[in-house]
């Protein structure tokens, strides 16, 4: 018996071939011997089966001795043995229809779980293997689960159902809702304008929800809400903003916040959360601000940084085009009685200068 695998919702074509290459009488029946369709001369006739409105054949092939049964919009319950009667012969084809669906919405938040459920006909024992867009393979039986979805899991999942050494392939598009970056850090000199950007890693037609930025300043004992906002069809509207600092927010995506001035009291870490309509859970992005200040008070030239810096970062004070006068893996360095000229305060790591501030020291008369 020939086995054919089909996909729920798809169209399948079961073949039946006569030895004579001409149009002769044929009938397709199901396992209950109920006629599905056949021919009377050059006319297609249909029987009283449940497939009535979904069954068809290809009249253009009859003259070649081919009498296919086409079933549209396949259902799991269409799984059956189909019999083609032609030239006193019976050709049997076993059709097995499978369906694969995501348990919930195919738009899932980062960190959530994806469950894929296989619908299969009674008596079948299929195995399923799915491959994620980043090449991760998962296998199982009737259900497959992936916990802790990552951004790289966004895209087309390809699932192969195996039964009777035949296979059928399903493609499911999964969108992982997340920010492009889990964390970012901004380095600024005191007084400079600060731009925070929170680009999303997905695009959807309509995006509605609400968000908030909580900020933990290095100098503060507790965190506070800096801004709350609403998102309606990708349009941003501010609900509430603190007086200090007075953040500004862009009206369109990507989410964009502007801090008019980088000041030591603002240095620290923030957490932007975004709750999307009809979704449980929230999207998160951490943002960090490091602020540098170079000052001269009487005979003391000082450079300081505030904010979440790596302990490996080096803070240096140097006269332009000269060797560093002082370099320390600390958050403050100073030079007593600095000579006149343009001094540079540098914050660097193993690969680059991250932040630089210049200060002019005038000659003392």
């Amino acid at each position: 018996k020939k086995v054919v695998l089909g996909k729920k919702g798809d169209t399948v074509e079961l073949t039946c071939t006569a030895s004579q290459k001409k149009s002769i009488q044929f009938h397709w029946k199901n396992s209950n011997q109920i006629k599905i369709l056949g021919n009377q001369g050059s006319f297609l006739t249909k029987g009283p089966s449940k497939l009535n409105d979904r069954a068809d054949s290809r009249r253009s092939l009859w003259d070649q001795g081919n009498f296919p049964l086409i079933i549209k919009n396949l259902k799991i319950e269409d799984s059956d043995t189909y019999i083609c009667e032609v030239e006193d012969q019976k050709e049997e084809v076993q059709l097995l229809v499978f369906g694969l669906t995501a348990n919930s919405d195919t738009h899932l938040l980062q960190g959530q779980s994806l469950t894929l459920t296989l619908e299969s006909p009674p008596g079948s024992s299929p195995s399923v293997q799915c491959r994620s867009p980043r090449g991760k393979n998962i296998q199982g039986g009737k259900t497959l689960s992936v916990s802790q979805l990552e951004l790289q899991d966004s895209g087309t999942w390809t699932c192969t159902v195996l039964q009777n050494q035949k296979k059928v392939e399903f493609k499911i598009d999964i969108v992982v809702l997340a920010f492009q970056k889990a964390s970012s850090i901004v380095y600024k000199k005191e007084g400079e304008q600060v731009e925070f950007s929170f680009p999303l890693a997905f695009t959807v037609e309509k995006l509605t929800g609400s968000g908030e930025l909580w900020w933990q300043a290095e100098r503060a004992s507790s965190s506070k809400s800096w801004i709350t906002f609403d998102l309606k069809n990708k349009e941003v509207s501010v609900k509430r903003v603190t007086q200090d600092p007075k953040l500004q927010m862009g009206k369109k995506l990507p989410l964009h916040l502007t801090l008019p001035q980088a000041l030591p009291q603002y240095a620290g870490s923030g957490n932007l959360t975004l709750a999307l309509e009809a979704k449980t859970g929230k999207l998160h992005q951490e943002v960090n601000l490091v602020v540098m200040r170079a000052t001269q008070l009487q005979k003391n030239l000082t450079c300081e940084v505030w904010g979440p810096t790596s302990p490996k970062l080096m803070l240096s004070l140097k006269l332009e085009n000269k060797e560093a006068k002082v370099s320390k893996r600390e958050k403050a360095v100073w030079v007593l009685n600095p000579e006149a000229g343009m001094w540079q305060c540098l914050l660097s790591d193993s690969g680059q200068v991250l932040l630089e501030s210049n200060i002019k020291v005038l000659p003392t008369w």
């Epitope: 960090n288 790596s310 490996k312 370099s327 914050l347 790591d349 193993s350 690969g351 680059q352 991250l354």
Partner: antibody
Amino acid sequence: QVQLVESGGGVVQPGRSLRLSCAASGFTFSSYGMHWVRQAPGKGLEWVAIIWYDGNNKYYADSVKGRFTISRDNSKNTLYLQMNSLRAEDTAVYYCTREVALEGYYYYMDVWGKGTTVTVSS
Amino acid sequence: AIQMTQSPSSLSASVGDRVTITCRASQGIRNGLGWYQLKPGKAPKLLIYAASSLQSGVPSSFSGSGSGTDFTLTISSLQPEDFATYYCLQDYNYPYTFGQGTKLEIK
């Protein structure tokens, strides 16, 4: 393509000196911190030293401090390790590796050489 | 110097198994931790950086987690090519320090 090739290894007597070199190609050498890492026979990996992109900052493992000196020549795209007062326990395969620094926040060693073998024996 | 304690020191497993290796820092290192794979006669290979970020080109069966002092490397389904020695490295502060290593062998 990005490549690191170590050289200069060999057999040396205890108390003597040796200089290892690491030739870099396929990337902007002067924009990366560079490390030496070693593996003694039958032992695990041990970090040895780092030199920053401009050569101004160097840090060492306690086990080599005062005996080894890391240096670089950015014009020649080459990293060095000067090893003085060598001991039997310095016998190892020495790897050079580059450090990627992202935003002063994330660090990792993504490209490694194949290593050069140093044997300290009398 | 920050000490890194890695466990277990050796591990026997079969192809398809899920394996977990842990690393503990003697003090908080935020997410300043990487995982490296070493095979005999080969150069070490970066798998995970910043505790949980998968290096480009590394199979997604590898994942890292943790922050502060406790970290984990998980291989969700062992492949024949995964049998090797694994090391954690703290790159939070100088001097950098490796864990003692975990030798993963075929059962």
